[in-house]
């Protein structure tokens, strides 16, 4: 029950996180005009990953897309890439995790397969969250650098008399949305990985051992006895789980918690 809850909660948290990453990526307010210690202007500038906008005091807002790829700063391109990778990985992770949910039955899918998928989606969510956090942090760092550069020459003298208003940009709402969303996706991923450990059947005391008698059908030796001698060159000692005796192939399909490190 706890495993199902952990997995379900991990899925929901990741879903919210990825929705937040998508929202942040699409938002226009990655950087907003700094209003502190600045002349109060009748226009408010803000910029996103895809376009820049100007809101006039009249209420009119005009947005212009960045219609160039080569002309954009490399850092902006990197942030775009990180956010898109985060979204793609998150979306795939969500798709995988839907099928991995313990509460959803799809055909005769084994718990081992579900555990596999849960872990896969968990890792995807973790990487997705890290991509988003990295993207937002790179952009924030870029803003901080530019902020202090523009503060250094906030008013550029022109002929000694005329002053030019230097527009400074500070953190926009999208950055905070991105950080929170990335964090949620990361937490969701960790929860999925924890749930995976609970889904994967644990190694316990063995009730039976199966081994191959050369060329013959599988033999079972009850009583927890572990055969140490073989009947032929292809004889293998196999561990049987508490769930009862199974064929060698079935047993092998269960991942152990040590399969993923």
């Amino acid at each position: 029950m706890a495993v199902t809850a952990c997995q379900g909660l991990g899925f929901v948290v990741s879903l919210i996180g990825i929705a937040g990453i998508i929202a942040a990526t699409c938002m226009d307010q990655w950087s907003t005009q700094d209003l502190y210690n600045n002349p109060v202007t009748a226009v408010f500038n803000y910029q996103g990953l895809w376009r820049s906008c100007v809101r006039e005091s009249s209420g009119f807002t005009e947005c212009r897309g960045y219609f160039t790829l080569l002309g954009l700063p490399a850092m902006l391109q990197a942030v775009r890439a990180l956010m898109i990778v985060g979204i793609v990985l998150g979306a795939i992770g969500l798709l995988v995790s839907i099928f991995a949910l313990k509460c959803i039955r799809i055909g005769s899918m084994e718990d081992s397969a579900k555990a596999n998928m849960t872990l896969t989606s968990g890792i995807m969510f973790i990487v997705s969250g890290l991509c988003a956090i990295a993207g937002v942090s790179v952009f924030a760092n870029m803003l901080v650098t530019n902020f202090w550069m523009s503060t250094a020459n906030m008013y550029t003298g022109m002929g000694g008399m005329v002053q030019t208003v230097q527009t400074r940009y500070t953190f926009g709402a999208a950055l905070f949305v991105g950080w929170v969303a990335g964090g949620l996706t990361l937490i969701g991923g960790v929860m999925m990985c924890i749930a995976c450990r609970g889904l994967a059947p644990e190694e316990t005391n063995y009730k039976a051992v199966s081994y191959h008698a050369s060329g013959h059908s599988v033999a079972y030796k009850p009583g927890g006895f572990k055969a140490s001698t073989g009947f032929g060159s292809n004889t293998k000692n196999k561990k049987i789980y508490d769930g009862g005796a199974r064929t060698e192939d079935e047993v092998q399909s269960y991942p152990s918690k040590h399969d993923y490190v």
């Epitope: 005009q33 002349p39 109060v40 202007t41 009748a42 226009v43 500038n45 910029q47 820049s52 906008c53 100007v54 006039e56 005091s57 009249s58 209420g59 009119f60 005009e62 212009r64 022109m158 005329v162 002053q163 030019t164 208003v165 527009t167």
Partner: antibody, heavy 117, light 113 residues
Framework: QVQLQESGPGLVKPSQTLSLTCTVS????????ISWVRQPAGKGLEWLGE???????NYNSALKSRVSISKDNSKSQVFLKLSSVTAADTARYYC???????????WGQGTLVTVSS | DIVMTQSPDSLTVSLGERATINCKSS????????????LTWYQQKPGQPPKLLIY???TRESGVPDRFTGSGSGTDFTLTISSLQAEDVAVYYC?????????FGPGTKLEIK
């Protein structure tokens, strides 16, 4: 069509509060901001302040402590209050609708206010 | 506050001739966000409210004759009337629409010679 009409008392005593109303039609105050401008006889234009679509305001720093702009969206009315008036506040008061570039594309005919005892 | 200055104070031009009015601001009116200059030109005829001619320094308001042209950037702006008509007799004002308070120029009185 778009119309703006200023109204209020034509005569105000010194030290009293001047109260003017701008009634608009043909557009909504939730979509357009309104600005107040005054013009003393034979002189230039002076911007007093503006009220934005959301109700936020900005005033001329020279009059900041005396001027107040508010509005009633449902009645399509914008109000200007100027306290502690003196003879220097005698002017024609206009309200205008803000448009692209924060320009005033439509103006009222203006109302003449005289400050005298 | 931004100080707006206009030159000349008054201008007398013959009908059909070109009229040029200059406006200078003490600070740049160019917004880096959209590379637009927040300067507006108004025309005011006696006994009438001002009429919008040009916004964003060079964008003509709809219904304004194309003989009116706005130009300039940063701190120096110009309103040009290519061929003066009798109905153009008025006072012309420039306005800073960028930094509060949104100050007006003192005006330029245009008359016919």
């Amino acid at each position: 069509q778009v119309q703006l009409q200023e109204s209020g008392p034509g005569l105000v005593k010194p030290s009293q509060t001047l109260s003017l109303t701008c009634t608009v039609s043909g557009f909504s105050l939730t979509s357009y901001a309104i600005s107040w401008v005054r013009q003393p006889a034979g002189k230039g234009l002076e911007w007093l302040g503006e009220i934005w679509t959301g109700g936020g305001t900005n005033y001329n720093s020279a009059l900041k402590s005396r001027v107040s702009i508010s509005k009633d969206n449902s009645k399509s009315q914008v109000f200007l209050k100027l306290s502690s008036v003196t003879a220097a506040d005698t002017a024609r008061y206009y309200c205008g609708r803000l448009s692209y570039g924060n320009s005033l594309d439509y103006w009222g005919q203006g109302t003449l206010v005289t400050v005298s005892s | 506050d931004i100080v707006m200055t206009q030159s000349p104070d008054s201008l007398t031009v013959s009908l059909g001739e070109r009229a040029t009015i200059n406006c200078k601001s003490s600070q740049s009116l160019l917004n880096s966000g959209n590379q637009k200059n927040y300067l507006t030109w108004y025309q005011q005829k006696p006994g009438q409210p001002p009429k919008l001619l040009i916004y964003w320094a060079s964008t003509r308001e709809s219904g304004v004759p194309d003989r009116f042209t706005g130009s300039g950037s940063g701190t120096d702006f110009t309103l040009t009337i290519s061929s003066l008509q009798a109905e153009d007799v008025a006072v012309y004002y420039c306005q800073n629409n960028f930094i509060y308070p949104l100050t007006f120029g003192p005006g330029t009185k245009l008359e016919i010679k």
